[in-house]
């Protein structure tokens, strides 16, 4: 299940991954030394019955339909890290791999 | 981040894990030999700003606020498998670990 990839010109209404560049400079997040911006992507779209479901559980909860369950939503199902150079709260420069920064795939869960 | 656990008597409105027993017999899924029912749990509740966010990405997308991004939703952030005995489509009996069957934790992503 590779998920769908869309862009701003797509007419796709279902759950899809869209391009998004996060710009730390524009946020004023100057404790991040590098990168100043990166391709993060995001998920958006509708989760129709059985479409792009990551887990069997998603379908089962739809079947069981408990009170308060809102149905699946379009959310990252595969994420990846990026390397970042930044100041920690002690003003030390840290170089490290930060998980959960890039959406590689979207799905319904 | 362990997530919240609730039950049907809870007054919690935020993203929370609720108990749910899935009953295969009740669904009429007779190809599943065992278990006939299991504790699956489900996620429900509101995702307020910065609450229970699994990934840094979730916060960054809220900051960047792209067109069409719906905001984070309450979804499983940790799942586990169960062992199942079932008939496959060739009517062979299979015993195996089926991933993504139990919600261990809920969060906003």
């Amino acid at each position: 299940n590779l998920g769908l990839d869309c862009d701003e010109h797509s007419s796709e209404s279902r759950c899809c991954r869209y391009p998004l560049t996060v710009d730390f400079e524009a946020f004023g997040w100057d404790w991040i030394i590098a990168p100043k911006r990166y391709k993060a992507n995001y998920c958006s779209g509708q989760c129709e019955y059985m479409f792009m479901q990551k887990y069997p559980h998603t379908h089962l909860v739809q079947q069981a339909n408990p009170r308060g369950s809102a149905g699946p939503c379009c959310t990252p199902t595969k994420m990846s890290p990026i390397n970042m150079l930044y100041f920690n709260d002690k003003q030390q420069i840290i170089y490290g791999k930060i998980p959960g920064m890039v959406v590689d795939r979207c799905g319904c869960s | 981040n362990l997530g919240l656990d609730c039950d049907e008597h809870s007054s919690e409105s935020r993203c929370c894990r609720y108990p749910l027993t899935v009953d295969f017999e009740a669904f009429g899924w007779d190809w599943i030999i065992a278990p006939k029912r299991y504790k699956a749990n489900y996620c429900s509740g509101q995702c307020e700003y910065m609450f229970m966010q699994k990934y840094p990405h979730t916060h960054l997308v809220q900051q960047a606020n792209p067109r069409g991004s719906a905001g984070p939703c309450c979804t499983p952030t940790k799942m586990s498998p169960i062992n199942m005995l079932y008939f496959n489509d060739k009517q062979q009996i299979i015993y195996g670990k089926i991933p993504g069957m139990v919600v261990d934790r809920c969060g906003c992503s």
Epitope: E25, D30, I33, P35, L85, I93 | -
Partner: antibody, heavy 124, light 107 residues
Framework: QVQLVQSGAEVKKPGASVKVSCKAS????????MHWVRQAPGQGLEWIGN????????NYNQRFKARATLTVDKSTSTAYMELRSLRSDDTAVYYC?????????????????WGQGTLVTVSS | DIQMTQSPSSLSASVGDRVTITCKAS??????LSWFQQKPGKAPKTLIY???RLVDGVPSKFSGSGSGTDYTLTISSLQPEDFATYYC?????????FGQGTKLEIK
């Protein structure tokens, strides 16, 4: 466009201090390291130190640590290099330069923009 | 401190020539080496970074190579505007150190 404009030439007596300014424009001043480099007449380039304007974290060449102070004024996007107890061999052109990261590793950078230089003459 | 030894200190060449300038570090600098061009009365200009990457807008006649302790700047076909002084810089560790420069003169 990104620009660094330095203050004008200075003539100082031995033992005095000098403060050279470097005004940045065309980018987010607080988010990029500023470096200072000097060049004595007819000589090579010598690194003095750097400063990160966001939090004023700085590094110095040990040769200058006792006499040089790097500061910033975020409100005016200006970096300063002050050198105290001047000697005749401090006569040099002083440059500021912006450090630009092309990657994320600690050394993944180069100088993409330089100031025009400030000549400091130390003479009795 | 890491010592950067640049050679030759001066070089005479003609328009159209191919020239090579070398820089030797006193220890491995992991390819964290930049090359600069400086003209009289002007600030230095970065040509090459990370040993072999060309800065945007710099002509491709400039190229860099090397690893470990030994690095080279090559100018493939000299033009009148290339006569200047060239410096190397190691940025692998503090303090940053420059080579002493190579003055490229017209023959």
């Amino acid at each position: 466009q990104v620009q660094l404009v330095q203050s004008g030439a200075e003539v100082k007596k031995p033992g005095a201090s000098v403060k050279v300014s470097c005004k940045a424009s065309g980018y987010s001043f607080t988010g990029y390291f500023m470096h200072w480099v000097r060049q004595a007449p007819g000589q090579g380039l010598e690194w003095i130190g750097n400063i990160y304007p966001y939090n004023s974290v700085s590094n110095y060449n040990q040769r200058f640590k006792a006499r040089a102070t790097l500061t910033v004024d975020k409100s005016t996007s200006t970096a300063y290099m002050e050198l105290r107890s001047l000697r005749s061999d401090d006569t040099a052109v002083y440059y500021c330069a912006r450090r630009y990261y092309y990657g994320t590793g600690p050394a993944d950078w180069y100088y993409d923009v330089w100031g025009q230089g400030t000549l400091v003459t130390v003479s009795s | 401190d890491i010592q950067m030894t640049q050679s030759p200190s001066s070089l005479s060449a003609s328009v159209g020539d191919r020239v090579t300038i070398t820089c030797k570090a006193s220890q491995d600098i992991n390819s964290y080496l930049s090359w600069f061009q400086q003209k009289p009365g002007k600030a230095p200009k970065t040509l090459i970074y990370r040993a072999n990457r060309l800065v945007d807008g710099v002509p491709s006649k400039f190229s860099g190579s090397g690893s470990g302790t030994d690095y080279t700047l090559t100018i493939s076909s000299l033009q009148p505007e290339d006569f200047a002084t060239y410096y190397c810089l190691q940025s692998d560790e503090f303090p940053l150190t420059f080579g002493q420069g190579t003055k490229l003169e017209i023959k």
